[in-house]
Every structure is written in structure tokens, then in C-alpha cells.
């Protein structure tokens, strides 16, 4: 099946201190390689979460990514702060013959708006 990375929400709004879910699904797990979430684009993009076992504070996977047929790579960001605002991209990589892996497809991006916490 042809690989497609889908981020269904163009944008989400979340109050500071709350949690938000950023959705991402794939149509295929092939070619093998990791899935990572970034904020921003280009050289300055920031790695937010990687489905490769590392620990990321405040960010967790939503579904059980250890399922061998898992195609849901959505993440939950907890205790959101104004600094978390920006556009988040779910990116599929193909394993490389050497570092780094090759980016092969990205979702369309989900913009996160952080609202001031109601007083």
C-alpha cells in the first residue's frame, strides 16, 4: 500500500496548562524507519518526539506504538505552555545505510494555538 502520512487537524487550540492531542496516521509502515514529530521546518526545526524509545518530557504516544501493525502515531502534549505554540509535523523516515535516516514524507502540519489560561 502506498505510504501516506495524514494529520487530519490543520489547527488545534489549547489553554495553557491543559493537554492536547496531535493526530497522525500512516497508511503503510514500509519502508521501515522511524516516525518523528517536529515543531517548525527547515534547519531550525525542533524534535518534539521520536517513536524510537527515548524519553521526552511532557510528550507521550497516544496508542500502543509497540504493536507490530500500529499505524497511529498521534502524541499527547501535557501541561502546554505558550512556548509550545507553533506548527507540528509528523514525519516518516526510511532507514539509511548510515546516519542520518532519510526523510521520505511529512504530514501537512498541525498548528497549535495556546490560549491564555482563564483567570
Amino acid at each position: 500500500k502506498e505510504l501516506k502520512v495524514t494529520q487530519p487537524e490543520k489547527s488545534v487550540s489549547v489553554a495553557a496548562g491543559d493537554s492536547t492531542v496531535l493526530n497522525c496516521t500512516l497508511t503503510s509502515l514500509l519502508p521501515v524507519g522511524p516516525i518523528k514529530w517536529y515543531r517548525g521546518v527547515g534547519q531550525s526545526r525542533l524534535l518534539i518526539y521520536s517513536f524510537t524509545g527515548e524519553h521526552f518530557p511532557r510528550v507521550t504516544n497516544v496508542s500502543d506504538a509497540t504493536k507490530r501493525n500500529n499505524m497511529d502515531f498521534s502524541i499527547r502534549i501535557s501541561n502546554v505552555t505558550p512556548e509550545d505554540a507553533g506548527t507540528y509535523y509528523c514525519v516518516k523516515f526510511q532507514k539509511g545505510p548510515s546516519e542520518p535516516d532519510t526523510e521520505i514524507q511529512s504530514g501537512g502540519g498541525t498548528e497549535v494555538y495556546v490560549l491564555a489560561k482563564p483567570s
Partner: antibody, heavy 118, light 107 residues
Framework: DVQLVESGGGVVRPGESLRLSCAAS????????MSWVRQAPGKGLEWLAG????????YYIDSVKGRFTISRDNPKNSLYLQMSSLTAEDTAVYYC???????????WGLGTLVTVSS | ALTQPASVSANPGETVKITCSGG??????YAWYQQKSPGSAPVTVI????KRPSDIPSRFSGSASGSAATLIITGVRVEDEAVYYC???????????FGAGTTLTVL
């Protein structure tokens, strides 16, 4: 330190059943997929079954499907392999192994010996 | 099935390469497992083609390209004598497989 300790091996007769256990410590067991691998005397390694971190999804090699069942109890940090209709060909050292994110293995137990003999 | 040589030998200090073929680069990740005696616990020396666990000496390295993976031991030592198993995970079939093992003898 990651530690995996298998138990439950022993000598059984052909056709009988056995349940192996693997006690895990030193890591967040509920976050990792796990597998069982065996090694028959004088032979190589053979993967048998795997289970997702939450326990809802299981995977088997064709030769043990329907006879072996992998399961886990996350609150008890334990992995199990229920084996039935055992034959002499099931004689082996059985290892539990922790899976990496891409379903290879990073840590192994010391193994437990199962002998099927009449 | 994954195919690897039955045996290799080397003198201490030499570089050893063990190859493993039969996987599909598009769908397979490779690992290498060291077993020092039959029935003893295997030790993972390389996973994810080229990732070395933190407690494994830096003389062990791995690579993969095409349909083959390679384990490289640079400056082999007597204590590296063991059987080395190539392992693979196939993302197409969701199945793990192993090669038959390569016996490394350090002369």
C-alpha cells in the same frame, strides 16, 4: 539494571503442557513489547512469539500457532508462555527478550530448560 | 531466511567482518547477538542495523545496505570468541528470524 529471569522449565512427557514465566525488573515493563525465543540442543536461535506492551496484540511463528500462547501481566511485571501438546522437538532452552522500538531484542534472560521426554 | 558463514577465524588485533544476507532492505532491520556458549544468555552487540548498546565495546560496529548486513569487530580480542547470530525483523510479515550463527575463533 534490566533483568529478565525465566522460570517454569522442567521435564515433561509428550503431549503434556507447561507454563513458562519471565520476571522483569529494572525498567518500565508496561512500556515494552516482549518476545520468547528458544534454542534446541546444538541448534541456533528460533523466535517463537511476541506481544505488544499493552498485551492486546500477539504474534507467532507458524510452527507454534495454536499450541503456544504468549501473555503478560503488567502489574506483576511478568511475561508468560503457555505451551501445550509438547513434543520432543520442543526440547530447548527458552529465553524471554525485551524488544526495541523496531522489534529486535536488546536484553535477554538467562533461559529456562524444557525437556520433553517419555 | 538469513544466511551467514558457519565460521570465521582471526588473529588478535585483526578486523573481522561477518556478513548476513537474505533480508529485504526496504522491510528489514538487522541485529547481531553474541552467545559465548550454547545455552547461555545471548548478548545484543548491535541492533537497528548499526546501533551499539551503551555497555558494548566500541570495537563492535554494524552496517546494512542492499539485502545484507555486516558485523565488524575492529581489533578482535580473545574474549570475543563466540557464536554470532544475525537477527532480522521483517516489517512486511511482522516476523523475527535468525541466521544459523557464525562461530568466531580467535587464534
Amino acid at each position: 539494571d534490566v533483568q529478565l529471569v525465566e522460570s517454569g522449565g522442567g521435564v515433561v512427557r509428550p503431549g503434556e503442557s507447561l507454563r513458562l514465566s519471565c520476571a522483569a525488573s529494572g525498567f518500565t515493563f508496561s512500556s515494552y513489547a516482549m518476545s520468547w525465543v528458544r534454542q534446541a540442543p546444538g541448534k541456533g536461535l528460533e523466535w517463537l512469539a511476541g506481544i505488544s506492551a499493552g498485551g492486546s496484540d500477539t504474534y507467532y511463528i507458524d510452527s507454534v500457532k495454536g499450541r503456544f500462547t504468549i501473555s503478560r501481566d503488567n502489574p506483576k511485571n511478568s511475561l508468560y508462555l503457555q505451551m501445550s501438546s509438547l513434543t520432543a522437538e520442543d526440547t530447548a532452552v527458552y529465553y524471554c527478550a525485551r524488544e526495541t522500538w523496531n522489534h529486535l531484542f536488546d536484553y535477554w534472560g538467562l533461559g529456562t530448560l524444557v525437556t520433553v521426554s517419555s | 531466511a538469513l544466511t551467514q558463514p558457519a565460521s570465521v577465524s582471526a588473529n588478535p588485533g585483526e578486523t573481522v567482518k561477518i556478513t548476513c544476507s537474505g533480508g529485504d532492505y526496504y522491510s528489514t532491520y538487522y541485529a547481531w547477538y553474541q552467545q559465548k556458549s550454547p545455552g547461555s544468555a545471548p548478548v545484543t552487540v548491535i541492533h537497528s542495523d548499526d546501533k551499539r548498546p551503551s555497555d558494548i565495546p566500541s570495537r563492535f560496529s554494524g552496517s546494512a545496505s542492499g539485502s545484507a548486513a555486516t558485523l565488524i569487530i575492529t581489533g578482535v580480542r580473545v574474549e570475543d570468541e563466540a557464536v554470532y547470530y544475525c537477527g532480522g525483523y521483517d516489517g512486511r510479515t511482522y516476523i523475527n528470524t535468525f541466521g544459523a550463527g557464525t562461530t568466531l575463533t580467535v587464534l
